[in-house]
Interface confidence: low
């Protein structure tokens, strides 16, 4: 007998399938598997060459050698031979192609009377009207249940006509279905038209919640409606907990704003805080082969009815892919203030600020900046000096963001745009950052706080002081003084004590002259080298009634050092029992060079000093 | 301003138990979720409890249901987290968290949860 020529044969998809006639396998017998090649679903399918006496038992082939075979060939095997390929095929559990399983399905033209030697799939392809017995229909329809009906598209006219066959074949009348109906149908369940879902739907939610593929629009609002209604097995969304949210999953997309909206808030936040960072939770994508760059390709599009038309909570539903696809950029820069009332993941916001990005390449203008919320945490500082900041409405709005927290280097660049903007340190402007953060004036460089102008002074508040060194007070002092000038005593002294680390010996004397009853919290902040001049009875005047606490202090600066300076029995007139003073009969002469560079007498600073008894006796004196 | 100030925090032997109190001041009412989260050293923050506003319903991840409980006086303000078998992994800073927008929005300073032998 002579052997046919060999040629190369496509299988479904378009992929090279076997190189040799398969069919000479399955109807002569003729030949051997040698070589393999990789078949399209990352099986391995075998090309056969050799020749055999004797035809061959199909079920002895291994699934390898079972693979990829092309449908123009299993057009000329007999019924009895194409029944024994797709028993060996759901034996060996080999996994076909749609065109393989269509072309199959048509060479079995009698109905099959072993459904359960069939592969599960194949049955998918089978015309239903085949098996119109009540027993016949009933043993079709449970194999059916088990298969993969995804296999086919939704549209596709052997999908379609198996859900009203199913349906007649279960009894099922009008649209009321049970759970053994609904379990009954299987796959066919992710078909049910809205009806079934509006008077079904305690049975029918949770099904459809695993419905691999989107639901239709009908599907949709039907499902959302009942939802809605707050009917079993849900109950009303303003109960759901994390468990509801778990349950629901698979209809997330489908709950519009008024759902979303009624659902305990906390309960949205923790169920999106532990899905963000729980990958175990997330459903799987269904694999499917195809090369990469088809996939991203395929991802740029928007699904069908996925568009998003404006920016609500309905979004935070999306798959990150999704937004990029759906979401236009100018669309979310004009509805920006709604970004921080939804509960995006962190990656969903890193979407959102690569469509700004992309939308904005030199810088956010102000409208978009003022209402990006926790997007601002997203930015970086290279980010933000593109930015221009005018408003302080803007600054308030993303300081808010940033509360509670230390100053980032976002922040940090952020006040650092605003302020060189605005070309000086304002009251309105120091006013709002000390509010946010008490410590930043005591953050800004003597230099930098020599551009505050005295009118914003009157912004400062005590706490805002609380870390500022000597050498910023130096500064701040002087602005202070200038800005209270026109305050009478007791009121003067209220807002300037705060900044009396940097005052003069000159100040502090004046002030001692005006019963101000400095505390000794203040007192303890003034500078020693202002203190120190000081007489006894300067220091009683200064402090009032608080004169009593030098004592819990006399060990500490700037106490100490002024203590060194006083003679002993003036100390001794407060009562105090302060020790440590000059006694009488002793000359303090103080030989620094900073004392005749400065003329401030500096007991305890660099230099020599010379103490020298003398004898002040009257006697030698005449 | 919101202010959440938690309290109740410190050393505990393994198996021991904790409660920790969160007081609530500022422009809040009862109407806002609120929850605790921990930090251990080097890890993210991962919430450990969340309560809603005028219901029972309440939020716990598997790693501390059953020993957890959450619950609110929102007559004082107030938000408790009881801590029953602690374990050496409960170790962590605590915070108390206030809802803002779908979101644990406003946090608390902490307080160092330590269970340890």
């Known amino acids: 007998m002579a052997l046919p020529t060999a040629r190369p044969l496509l299988g479904s998809c378009g992929t090279p399938a076997l190189g040799s006639l398969l069919f000479l396998l399955f109807s002569l017998g003729w030949v051997q598997p040698s070589r393999t090649l990789a078949g399209e679903t990352g099986q391995e399918a075998a090309p056969l060459d050799g020749v055999l006496a004797n035809p061959p038992n199909i079920s002895s082939l291994s699934p390898r050698q079972l693979l990829g075979f092309p449908c123009a060939e299993v057009s000329g095997l007999s019924t009895e031979r194409v029944r024994e390929l797709a028993v060996a095929l759901a034996q060996k559990n080999v996994k076909l192609s749609t065109e393989q399983l269509r072309c199959l399905a048509h060479r079995l033209s009698e109905p099959p009377e072993d459904l359960d030697a069939l592969p599960l799939d194949l049955l998918l392809f089978l015309n239903p009207d085949a098996f119109s017995g009540p027993q016949a229909c009933t043993r079709f329809f449970s194999r059916i249940t088990k298969a993969n009906v995804d296999l086919l598209p939704r549209g596709a006219p052997e999908r379609q006509r198996l859900l009203p066959a199913a349906l007649a074949c279960w009894g099922v009348r009008g649209s009321l279905l049970s759970e053994a109906d609904v379990r009954a149908l299987g796959g066919l369940a992710c078909d049910l038209p809205g009806r079934f879902v509006a008077e079904s739907a305690e049975v029918l939610l949770p099904r459809l919640v695993s419905c691999p593929g989107p639901l239709d629009q009908d599907q949709q609002e039907a499902a959302r409606a009942a939802l809605q209604g707050g009917g079993p097995p849900y109950g009303p969304p303003s109960t759901w907990s994390v468990s509801t949210m778990d349950a629901l999953r698979g209809l997330l997309p489908v709950l519009g704003q008024p759902i979303i909206r009624s659902i305990p808030q906390g309960i949205v936040a923790a169920w999106r805080q532990r899905s963000s960072r729980d990958p175990s939770w997330r459903q799987p994508e269904r694999t499917i082969l195809r090369p990469r760059f088809r996939r991203e390709v395929e991802k740029t599009a928007c699904p069908s009815g996925k568009k998003a038309r404006e920016i609500d909570e309905s979004l935070i539903f999306y798959k990150k892919w999704e937004l990029e696809a759906c979401v236009d950029a100018a669309l979310l820069a004009t509805q920006m203030d709604r970004v921080n009332a939804i509960p995006f993941t962190y990656e969903q916001l890193d979407v959102l600020k690569h469509k700004l990005d992309e939308l904005y390449p030199q810088g956010y203008p102000e409208s978009v900046i003022q209402h990006l919320g926790y997007l601002f945490l997203k930015m970086s500082p290279e980010d933000i000096r593109k930015w221009n900041v005018t408003s302080l409405e803007t600054l308030k709005a993303l300081l808010e963001v940033n509360k509670g927290h230390e100053m980032s280097p976002q922040v940090a660049t952020l006040i650092d745009r605003f302020v060189k903007g605005r070309g000086q340190l304002d009251k309105d402007t120091l006013d709002t950052l000390t509010a946010f953060y008490p410590g930043y004036l005591c953050s800004l460089s003597p230099e930098e706080l020599s551009s505050v102008p005295p009118s914003s002074i009157w912004a400062v508040r005590p706490q805002d002081l609380d870390t500022c060194d000597p050498r910023q007070l130096d500064v701040l002092y002087p602005k202070a003084r200038l800005a209270f000038q026109n305050m009478n005593g007791s009121e003067y002294f209220v807002k300037i004590q705060s900044f009396l680390g940097g005052a003069p010996t000159e100040d502090l004397k004046a002030l001692s002259q005006q019963n101000v009853s400095m505390d000794l919290a203040t007192f303890m902040k003034l500078r020693t080298d202002a203190v120190l001049p000081l007489t006894v009875a300067e220091v009683q005047k200064l402090l009032g009634p608080h004169v009593e606490g030098l004592k819990a202090e006399e060990r500490h600066r700037p106490v100490r050092d002024w203590i060194l300076r006083q003679r002993q029995d003036d100390l001794d007139t407060l009562g105090l029992g302060l020790q440590g003073g000059i006694p009488n009969g002793y000359l303090v002469l103080d030989l620094s060079m900073q004392e005749a560079l400065s003329g401030t007498p500096c007991l305890l600073g660099p230099g020599p000093v010379l103490t020298v008894l003398a004898l002040l006796l009257a006697s030698t004196l005449a | 301003e919101v202010q959440l100030v938690e309290s109740g925090g410190g050393l505990v032997q393994p198996g021991g138990s904790l409660r920790l109190s969160c007081a609530a001041s500022?422009?809040?009412?009862?109407?806002?979720?609120m929850g605790w989260f921990r930090q251990a050293p080097g890890k993210g923050r991962e919430l450990v409890a969340a309560?809603?506003?005028?219901?029972?319903?309440?939020y716990y991840p598997d790693s501390v249901e059953g020993r957890f409980t959450i619950s609110r006086d929102n007559a004082k303000r107030m938000v408790y987290l009881q801590m029953n078998s602690l374990r050496a992994e409960d170790t962590a800073v605590y915070y108390c968290?206030?809802?803002?927008?779908?979101?644990?929005?406003?946090w608390g300073q902490g307080t160092q949860v330590t269970v340890s032998s």
């Open positions: 309560i809603n506003s005028f219901s029972d319903i309440t």
């Open positions: 968290v206030r809802e803002r927008g779908y979101n644990f929005g406003y």
């Open positions: 500022g422009s809040t009412s009862g109407i806002y979720a």
